[in-house]
Interface confidence: medium
């Protein structure tokens, strides 16, 4: 009975050639889509000239099929019972699931201007930057197509910089024909309780972005967890998108296509300030923007982005402190639409459905040496876009799952 099922599960969730888990792990059988909503700035001139609140209007979804490529360079290491791999990146636009085309135009923050002024705070350097910004007719905001904004464009201001610098800019540049990793994960052969847990990422057990335990690479990549998941567990996972490990807690029982699953969610506590949740103290890396670490709901990942002032949050600044969003008009945070959840089949630990939601923001600060920023009176954490990456087990797979796993138990 139960012992036989446990034995079968333990055998089939191991990440090695011939198991059900391995086949799905190498190339996911689930179609994964990434929807983007772009924050179109309605009053660019008024912001630049008068430091007004930024009025944004989200436009989307613009949908791409992602994670359709098989893992590459899969190498088993029998000595430490690990398997290493690269996860190739690819995105294919899905016009039928989108509100427009990749040629749609958006008014967004000028990424290069915001980043350069942050990376080079020296006033003498900023005087030079200012002349290049003006010469290139760049401004605080720019109009870009969806394709340019996401996947990259040649920036006119950076093109004038007289020393070697990457002139290509994009929120996800470079993406296609790149890979995430190398990941080295436990294959579960020696201990099933460690299956899919990350041993090293890019050859290291920590990230070098954060202090103390915040820098650790914890848990799996969230595609699966060790089997026999309990509701009381805190599920740890690492997300390279947000440059940190994070966790999910049980919220509710859900029936997914006839399969009983546990819905785990990212709690607001994970985004709290160190004042509210002392565990988060090492995610606060500077004192000014964070108002002495009292702000919450945004994560400064600039160390992970070559110094560019990138801040990650939940969409529409869900679970963020009022000071973060007080400079932005037009946001409507909504838990149902904007939180992240994982629907996990508890016996196998497989994630059968998920919605990963995050928002990418850029910090822009006043600078009395840069004309297009000199009339700003305050700092802005400017939302650029938010994304919803979703995957749901297909009907065929669900049927197979019911008959082979949950059906046998029931």
């Amino acid at each position: 009975g139960d012992m036989l099922i446990q034995k079968t599960i333990k055998k089939e969730v191991v990440l090695e050639e011939g198991t059900i888990a391995f086949k799905n792990w190498v190339k996911t059988g689930t179609e994964i889509y990434r929807q983007f909503w772009i924050f179109d700035v309605q009053n660019p001139q008024e912001v630049m000239m008068n430091s007004s609140n930024i009025q944004v209007k989200q436009r989307g979804p613009y949908t791409y099929r992602v994670r359709f490529l098989a893992k590459e360079n899969i190498t088993q290491d029998p000595k430490d019972n690990t398997v290493s791999f690269l996860q190739p990146n690819g995105a294919i636009f899905e016009p039928s699931l989108s509100v427009g085309t990749e040629a749609d135009n958006f008014t967004v923050l000028n990424l290069a201007v915001a980043a350069a002024s942050h990376i080079y705070p020296n006033p003498f350097v900023q005087v030079v930057l200012n002349s290049l910004i003006n010469k290139s007719k760049s401004s605080m905001f720019q109009v870009r197509t969806l394709r340019e904004l996401l996947w990259g464009y040649t920036d006119p201001f950076l093109s004038l910089v007289p020393y070697p610098v990457s002139t290509r800019v994009g929120m996800f540049y470079p993406y296609n024909n790149t890979a995430d990793g190398v990941y080295k994960v436990f294959n579960g052969k020696d201990s099933i309780s460690k299956v899919a847990i990350i041993d090293t990422y890019k050859g290291k057990r920590n990230l070098s972005y954060w202090e103390s335990y915040c820098d650790m690479i914890n848990g799996t990549d969230a595609a699966s967890f060790p089997p026999f998941v309990e509701k009381s567990q805190v599920l740890q996972f690492f997300s390279s998108d947000i440059c940190r490990s994070i966790y999910a807690v049980f919220e509710s029982d859900v029936n997914l296509k006839g399969i009983p699953v546990y819905r785990f969610v990212l709690p607001s506590k994970a985004f709290a300030s160190p004042v509210q949740n002392p565990d988060n103290h090492c995610f606060c890396t500077e004192k000014i923007i964070s108002k002495n670490c009292t702000s919450y709901g945004v994560l400064d990942i600039s160390k992970c982005k070559e110094g560019k002032p990138v801040y990650i949050s939940l969409p529409h600044f869900l679970y963020a402190s009022p000071d973060v969003s007080e400079t932005i008009d037009g946001l409507n945070p909504n838990e149902e639409e904007h939180r992240t959840y994982l629907d996990i089949e508890p016996i196998t630990g497989f994630t059968l459905q998920f919605a990963k939601r995050l928002q990418v923001n850029l910090l822009v600060k006043p600078s009395n040496k840069i004309q297009v920023l000199k009339r700003l009176k305050r700092n802005y954490i400017v939302p650029i876009l938010w994304l919803n990456e979703t995957g749901t087990i297909g009907d065929e797979k669900a049927k197979m799952f019911r008959s082979q796993v949950t059906g046998k138990i029931n």
Epitope: M49, N50, S51, S52, R375, K377, R378
Partner: antibody
Framework: AVTLDESGGGLQTPGGALSLVCKAS????????MGWVRQAPGKGLEWVAG????????AYGSAVKGRATISRDNGQSTVRLQLSNLRAEDTGVYYC??????????????????????WGHGTEVIVSS | ALTQPSSVSASPGETVKITCSGS????YGWYQQKSPGSALVTVI????NRPSSIPSRFSGSTSGSTGTLTITGVRADDEAVYFC???????????FGAGTTLTVL
Amino acid sequence: AVTLDESGGGLQTPGGALSLVCKASGFDFSSYAMGWVRQAPGKGLEWVAGKAKDGGGTAYGSAVKGRATISRDNGQSTVRLQLSNLRAEDTGVYYCAKSAYGDWFYGSSGPYADSIDAWGHGTEVIVSS
Amino acid sequence: ALTQPSSVSASPGETVKITCSGSSDSWYGWYQQKSPGSALVTVIYDSTNRPSSIPSRFSGSTSGSTGTLTITGVRADDEAVYFCGSFDSSTDSTAFGAGTTLTVL
């Protein structure tokens, strides 16, 4: 077309008070900041006062600070300037000015003289005994 | 304070440039007044923006701390006093220039 009509000028006595009104038409008044600029005889332009679209932000020129009050009525599409303790130096033509934007400024002590996109014809004020 | 030349002159059809110098990089507005005390007309705001009613021969630019109003193919009815206006955000002060009288010969 944008029209700004000032009224309330005329001969005023030193130490007295005046109230100027600017009636706006031809645009969505509640979406734009408004202000007053004056010109003394034979002289240049001087900023007097400004008010943001929602009535929140207010700023005054240094020569009138403490004596001037600017207010607006978005329902009536009017902006009013009240100036007390009048002096001979307050003599001049007072122009109603429309900003290209909803705010003159954010947290700043003075509005901007570079963002005016429309003017009234002006109303003359003479302060004399 | 904003510095602009007290007068410039040009023959019809010529290009005329009126400059306005502030204390640092800034934006400029340009305002036309045909006679003292008469109505003001905005020809340029925010350094380069031209109201829709203003002919395209009027244009504005900035370079460093200097704003420039350019009138290409000047006409007799462009004869007026042109005031520049600016705001220095580093000192939070607003100012107008003393005016430049354009004479069309």
